[in-house]
């Protein structure tokens, strides 16, 4: 698949009608068969991935995908050049970090190019579409004698943009303790019992500073605190996903 | 299947302002993109805003800081709020519809809407 720049329009919304007449909308028909959604994220602002469910089309369809930013210097579509296979058709496309204006308006362009008027074209707002890396390098450190400190990294994006969900349990908890942690990648617990074992994990997500993501990222690695007594029913500690 | 009824259209003078809605019977919007359309006599049918059902609105350049796209899931309608009329607003405004999958998904092709409505006329004068 090779990187093409296709020159648009004033209105690729226009483009992309199917029938360019007088005729009133309700007598148009929509293509017998509609295009799969084209759903997009950015991991960790590194890379993106905008996907499709290419097993929806009733024939195997290498659908093309073109992009473009609506205030750029240059308006116009860019096909993708690195598309991401199912089973050898097109299934999405990876877009990498260069690429990626997260505060302007995305436009995205999924095509039939057998079937030209077969296309649809969607708008996407990104920064509501980052998830983020799991956060890292969990450290416990005790403050005072029952107070624990919990402090972790996350990698590439700015802290201040983050928001985190902290969860925890002692050996004795049979669900997690949890509450949201803003901007700052630390949490205090003022009490700990010494004689209980206790796990600690974090996820992220970009909100609701720098963007209204309502995707978390994974979980971190789980650390742990407190005594290393075999606990009285370990099926209540496993980790649950 | 969703219908979708428009009103609201009519005439007002140019720096005048229409509010056109769009009710939807048959079915809930709520997990349906929608789209405002417009067509002048003789010209391509041409976007003028969309929105998500996660809540994401797109306007055409035209139409940007002058229009408002907003909808309401409780009273099943979207509703387009235009300000600063100018007498190029003049045509025909249709509302349309589309079942989506994911919260994100926000159509400026109106080959992707599989239900309209049949249109209001808004005619903006001098």
């Known amino acids: 698949w090779s990187s093409k720049v296709l020159m648009s329009s004033a209105n690729e919304d226009i483009k992309a009608d199917l029938i360019l007449t007088s005729t009133a909308p309700e007598h148009l028909s929509a293509p017998t068969l509609p295009l799969p959604e084209v759903q997009c994220f950015v991991f960790n602002i590194e890379y993106m991935n905008c996907t499709w469910n290419s097993s929806s089309e009733p024939q195997a369809t290498n659908l093309t995908l073109h992009y473009r930013y609506k205030v750029s210097d240059n308006n116009t579509f860019q096909e993708c050049s690195h598309y991401l296979f199912s089973k050898e058709i097109t299934s999405g496309c990876q877009i990498q970090k260069e690429d990626i204006q997260l505060y302007q308006t995305f436009v995205v362009q999924l095509q039939d190019p057998q079937k030209p008027q077969r296309r649809a074209v969607q708008k996407l707002n990104l920064q509501n579409l980052v998830i983020p890396r799991a956060p890292e390098n969990l450290t416990l450190s005790n403050l005072s004698e029952s107070q624990l400190e919990l402090r972790w990294k996350s990698r590439h994006i700015k802290e201040r943009c983050l928001q985190y969900l902290v969860q925890y349990r002692s050996n004795r908890d049979r669900s997690w303790t949890e509450l949201i942690v803003n901007h700052e990648p630390r949490f205090s617990l003022p009490s700990v019992d010494e004689l209980k074992r206790y796990t600690f994990r974090v996820r992220s997500r970009y909100n609701p500073i720098c963007g209204s993501s309502q995707q978390w990222s994974k979980w971190s690695q789980p650390v742990h605190w407190g005594s290393h007594t075999v606990e009285e029913n370990p099926s209540l500690f496993a980790l649950e996903a | 299947q969703v219908q979708l009824q428009e009103s609201g259209g009519g005439l007002v003078q140019a720096g005048g302002s229409l509010r056109l809605s769009c009710a939807a019977s048959?079915?809930?919007?709520?997990?349906?993109?929608m789209g405002w359309f417009r067509q002048a006599p003789g010209k391509e049918r041409e976007f003028v805003a969309c929105d998500s059902w996660g809540g994401d609105t797109f306007y055409a350049d035209s139409v940007e800081g002058r229009f408002t796209f907003s909808r309401d899931n409780a009273k099943n309608a979207t509703y387009l709020q235009m300000n600063s009329l100018q007498p190029e607003d003049t045509a025909v405004y249709y509302c349309a519809g589309a079942p989506t999958s994911f919260a994100t998904t926000a159509y400026s092709s109106s080959n992707s809407y599989t239900v309209w409505g049949q249109g209001t006329q808004v005619t903006v004068s001098l």
């Open positions: 048959g079915r809930t919007l709520s997990r349906y993109a």
